[in-house]
């Protein structure tokens, strides 16, 4: 079934309560415009944003019978001429009579007659109508023939994009059959279709078709009020393409529209081939979009590549939400033109600062006021990380101008980075020389402490991304941050007693759930000694508060639990609810305190892994005193496992390479950084080691494990061949520095640095790290492998 037929069927369903063959139509209030009711329009009770009233009429082809409900009788079938009377197109019938067309359409043959309604004739320009009436034998006859096709075509045969030769000089009739059920012929809407006749079919249309002989190019060349657009089309080498065959829709801005543009904007765009071509193409659709087919907002791709939203408000057409079409449906032989009174500027023709919307005006105003706008050169490439207006507090705005400028510089990058270019672990450099980290989560992208909101755009000289908060690059390490805040003095002392201070000082990516002194309320000095006395217990407890990877609270999908594996090995459960982070269902007191090697979320309770039993009565008593949110298991004699600290030290490896090995890049897989289950995935690939191809079987174990590779630092490299030490060093640092694979050569383990060294020298691996231990160096996180 065609779209028209589907909508008609829907109208029939909506009208069946009124009796057989009754269709529900919706009439736009204050107009005579009626539409068969689509599902969407029915429920909205509106078309083009205007309220509608429901009318119940006989479905096409049926009629009422006196004293009976609905439309139980079928309309009589007659020849085309008689059918014009049946459908009420009496003016067309009269003109067919006086123009001597009557004999033709009463006789033999098969015709499709697109018959203008009586109202359509009334709306026709009076001079044109008079001209037809003054020359009925030629002009009127030709005009009517141009509404006819030499075969019967029902709406199901009227396919979108079809061009049917009319009976006048084979002039084309452009058929459009839209998904909303609207069928148009040269942009005239079929308001009553498929009235079958003995020798054809009649479709009533809402306007008289005027003869089409010109292309869009011809129209532009003839229309003085489009001279600006014409000149711009010539400049962009687009005018001739608008003379070619096609089904284009052109939104042509008038000269007045160009006058509305700030002169500077126009001068810049017209001086930039790429921008001016983008500007022109943004006004052209590769599909024919008649105004009558627009019954609600719809998005269309332009020739430029970006989309525009075409909507309607009553009789007016809006583009991107603004009423701007002042003349509709100028039909040409290769498309339709709508005259608009504003120039549409695509993002691709805008300067990066012009991409900002109403919600980022504080940022753009400050950028201009503090002299940063002038540093955004039109031929440069930048990225603006624009916080929304309410991110700027009064305190921030009243800051010293120099400080404010430094803050703003943290929001401008030296390069153009589009949304699709961002990846987890990426480091971005600002124009102020600061480095910002990118964190990619399941439903969020964050830079440092601030996460993006929708609305990223790419312009001519850069991109813009919108952020919830002002971005604050971290200055201090986790350890320094804890040390400068008195709230964490107890936790810090325990951390140091457990020999874990270095862990929070060295580079890395961690999430620390830092308990405040309140978490230890009531702990006596004896109890503290008890805790410190069992180093394994202390390490297990502290490392349960530390998770590899940076997890920003605002990056969490709201209301969804995220299961992370802590450094201690047990799981921790995080959830974002109403701007608050829940850690094991405990409310975080403060979150997203950024540091150079991670993020801190503040908790006022001590956290404990529910799966780890305690075997010491005194320790259990202490933990029960401090931890109320879970019931800690007691298993007499149970001890805490040792967590080998060597695992968390970054390794320094010396590699001496003799000779000139043949290095070839083999693309490594992603690091697994998510809690995953399932069968191992085994892949075979060949790696070139010391010039020799070696077949390696890779087993990606899908257990609950987080795997990351140690980072190797090369301190001395000597070569005995053509390659310079420097190039080879660069190559090694780039390509071999992160080993993030399970390689089967026993039971699926990570190589240690020594093994890598031996591999590079051609030996086979010997020493292995047990599979239940984690290797931790400064980490590379995978993009997909995040649980957020």
């Amino acid at each position: 079934n065609s779209y028209y037929d589907k909508v008609l069927a829907h109208s029939r369903i909506r009208g069946r309560d009124q009796g057989p063959n009754v269709c529900a139509l919706q009439q736009i209030l204050g107009t005579k415009k009626k539409y068969f009711s689509s599902c969407k329009n029915w429920y909205q009770g509106a078309i083009c944003g205007k309220k509608t009233t429901v009318l119940y009429e006989c479905c096409p082809g049926y009629m009422r019978m006196e004293g009976m409900k609905g439309c139980p009788a079928v309309m009589p079938i007659d020849h085309v001429y008689g059918t014009l009377g049946i459908v009420g197109a009496t003016t067309t019938q009269h003109y067919s009579d006086v123009s001597k067309l009557r004999e033709e359409i009463e006789g033999k043959g098969s015709y499709t007659y697109f018959a203008p309604s009586n109202e359509a004739w009334e709306n026709l320009d009076s001079d044109i109508r008079r001209g037809l009436e003054n020359n009925v034998n030629v002009e009127l006859l030709n005009a009517l023939h141009s509404h006819m096709v030499n075969k019967r075509m029902l709406t199901k045969d009227l396919k979108h994009g079809m061009v049917i030769p009319s009976m006048y000089n084979n002039l084309g009739l452009f058929i459009n059959h839209y998904p909303n059920g609207v069928v148009t012929v040269n942009c005239a809407r079929v308001i009553h279709g498929n009235q079958i006749a003995t020798n054809g079919v009649v479709h009533v249309i809402d306007r008289v078709l005027t003869q089409i002989g010109t292309s869009i190019q011809d129209f532009l060349e003839a229309e003085d009020d489009l001279s600006s657009f014409r000149a711009a089309a010539i400049t962009s080498d687009l005018l001739e393409s608008l003379g070619r065959d096609g089904h284009f829709t052109l939104f042509a801005p008038t000269n007045e529209a160009f006058e509305k543009l700030p002169r500077g904007v126009l001068e810049r765009i017209m001086g930039d081939k790429v921008a001016s071509e983008a500007l022109m193409k943004y006004h052209i659709l590769n599909t024919l979009q008649c105004s009558e087919a627009i019954t609600g907002g719809a998005v269309f791709e332009t020739m430029e590549g970006n989309t525009i939203e075409i909507g309607c408000e009553g009789d007016s057409i809006s583009i991107n939400g603004i009423k701007m079409v002042n003349k509709k449906d100028i039909v040409t032989k290769n498309g339709v033109i709508h005259l608009i009174d504003e120039v549409l500027i695509p993002d691709s023709a805008k300067q990066v600062i012009e991409l900002a919307g109403k919600q980022q005006t504080t940022f753009t105003d400050l950028v201009a006021q503090l002299g940063l706008a002038s540093s955004l050169k039109p031929d440069g490439e930048y990225t603006l990380l624009a916080p929304v207006n309410n991110a700027f507090s009064d305190d921030t705005l009243s800051m010293d101008q120099r400080l404010l400028k430094l803050i703003l510089q943290n929001h401008i990058l030296k390069v153009k980075v589009g949304l699709s270019d961002l990846y987890n672990g990426q480091i971005l450099e600002t124009i102020g020389g600061k480095q910002l980290r990118v964190f990619v989560y399941r439903t969020a992208i964050c830079i440092e402490n601030s996460c993006m909101v929708r609305g990223s755009k790419q312009g001519r000289n850069g991109a813009i991304h919108i952020f919830r908060e002002i971005i604050q690059p971290a200055e201090k390490s986790l350890h320094d941050k804890l040390r400068q805040d008195k709230r964490f003095s107890i936790f810090l002392s325990l951390l140091e007693a457990a020999d874990l201070k270095d862990l929070l000082t060295q580079p890395g990516d961690w999430t620390l759930f830092a308990p405040t002194n309140d978490a230890f309320k009531g702990m006596t000095s004896e109890e503290r000694e008890l805790l410190i006395g069992d180093k394994n217990a202390l390490q297990n407890i502290i490392l349960y508060h530390l998770t590899p990877g940076v997890y920003i609270g605002k990056g969490f999908e709201p209301g969804v639990t995220n299961i992370l594996k802590t450094t201690q090995g047990s799981k921790i459960y995080l959830k974002g609810v109403n701007e608050t982070l829940l850690v094991n269902e405990l409310k975080s007191k403060e979150s997203d305190i950024m540091t150079t090697n991670g993020v801190i979320h503040v908790v006022d309770k001590l956290l404990y892994p529910a799966d780890i039993p305690v075997g010491n009565d005194q320790l259990l008593e202490l933990l029960n005193k401090l931890i109320k949110y879970i019931q800690i298991k007691f298993v007499r004699g149970s001890t805490f496992k040792e967590i080998p600290m060597t695992v968390y030290r970054p390794a320094m490896t010396k590699i001496q390479i003799e000779g000139d090995p043949d290095f070839r890049l083999i693309k490594e897989g992603e690091t697994v950084t998510e809690v995953i289950h399932g069968e191992p995935v085994i892949k075979k690939y060949t790696k070139i080691i010391d010039g020799v191809p070696v077949e390696i079987t890779e087993k990606q174990t899908r257990e609950e494990r987080i795997i990351t590779g140690p980072e190797i630092k090369y301190t001395r490299i000597s070569t005995g061949g053509g390659e310079t030490g420097e190039t080879l060093q660069k190559f090694l640092q780039k390509e071999v520095s992160k080993v993030t694979k399970f390689i089967e050569g026993g039971d699926g383990h990570l190589f240690e640095d020594e093994e890598i060294k031996r591999l590079l020298q051609g030996d086979t691996p010997a020493k292995k790290i047990p599979a239940n231990k984690r290797v931790q160096g400064p980490r590379r996180r995978s993009r997909e492998g995040r649980s957020q």
């Epitope: 009020d225 000149a231 008038t254 160009f258 126009l266 001068e267 810049r268 017209m270 031929d379």
Partner: antibody
Framework: QVQLVQSGAEVKKPGASVKVSCKAS????????ISWVRQAPGQGLEWMGW????????NYAQKLQGRVTMTTDTSTSTAYMELRSLRSDDTAVYYC???????????WGQGTLVTVSS | QSVLTQSSSASGTPGQTVTVSCSGS????????VNWYQQLPGTAPKLLIY???QRPSGVPDRFSGSKSGTSASLAISGLQSADEADYYC???????????FGSGTKVTVL
């Protein structure tokens, strides 16, 4: 064909005002703007401002803001430029030019010499 | 004083190519398009090149324009005696919000 015909030469005293007219023909007057450009004797060109013949919107050069007024009369397809508080350095040939914006100053009037002398 | 800098004169013999240069800043030529005007002795200026390199209809293809960074140039090939005139470059200046002209270059055909 497109033509812009300007009013004749004027001699004015310092402090006075001058109003130069520019009658357009050969095109739809309201479809284009008009810019005014002046040229002091033996000197280069200086843009004074622009007016939309359709809306009457104007854009004046900062230097002349407050002293210059540009107007149009669509019924006669004529543009006017009035300069007040004349000084001797306002002595110049004043040109009107059709300004389509996309194609700037594509047709020029013949020029009107305004001499400011005491 | 003009915002755009042009060499005061240039000359060539018939048939030669003469290049007129125009130098500006990031706020004018650097950001916007350049247009060129020809002013024959005792006449009004005439648009020669617009949008850096576009010729209006009726302008011979001996005239060509180009722009790079903050400077632009006009090349006149196959120089003719009728080309003897003053040539002005012009561009919009974002910082002044004004249309600015160059000082003009007098081209002489030897």
């Amino acid at each position: 064909q497109v033509q812009l015909v300007q009013s004749g030469a004027e001699v004015k005293k310092p402090g006075a005002s001058v109003k130069v007219s520019c009658k357009a023909s050969g095109y739809t007057f309201t479809s284009y703007g008009i810019s005014w450009v002046r040229q002091a004797p033996g000197q280069g060109l200086e843009w004074m401002g622009w007016i939309s013949a359709y809306t009457g919107n104007t854009n004046y050069a900062q230097k002349l803001q407050g002293r210059v007024t540009m107007t149009t009369d669509t019924s006669t397809s004529t543009a006017y430029m009035e300069l007040r508080s004349l000084r001797s350095d306002d002595t110049a040939v004043y040109y009107c030019a059709r300004d389509m914006l996309v194609v700037p100053f594509d047709y020029w009037g013949q020029g009107t010499l305004v001499t400011v002398s005491s | 004083q003009s915002v755009l800098t042009q060499s005061s004169s240039a000359s060539g013999t018939p048939g030669q190519t003469v290049t007129v240069s125009c130098s500006g800043s990031s706020s004018d030529i650097g950001s916007n398009r350049v247009n060129w005007y020809q002013q024959l002795p005792g006449t009004a200026p005439k648009l020669l090149i617009y949008s850096n390199d576009q010729r209006p209809s009726g302008v011979p293809d001996r005239f060509s324009g180009s722009k790079s960074g903050t400077s632009a140039s006009l090349a006149i090939s196959g120089l003719q005696s009728a080309d003897e005139a003053d040539y002005y470059c012009a561009a919009w200046d974002d910082s002044l919000s004004t249309y600015v002209f160059g000082s003009g270059t007098k081209v002489t055909v030897l």
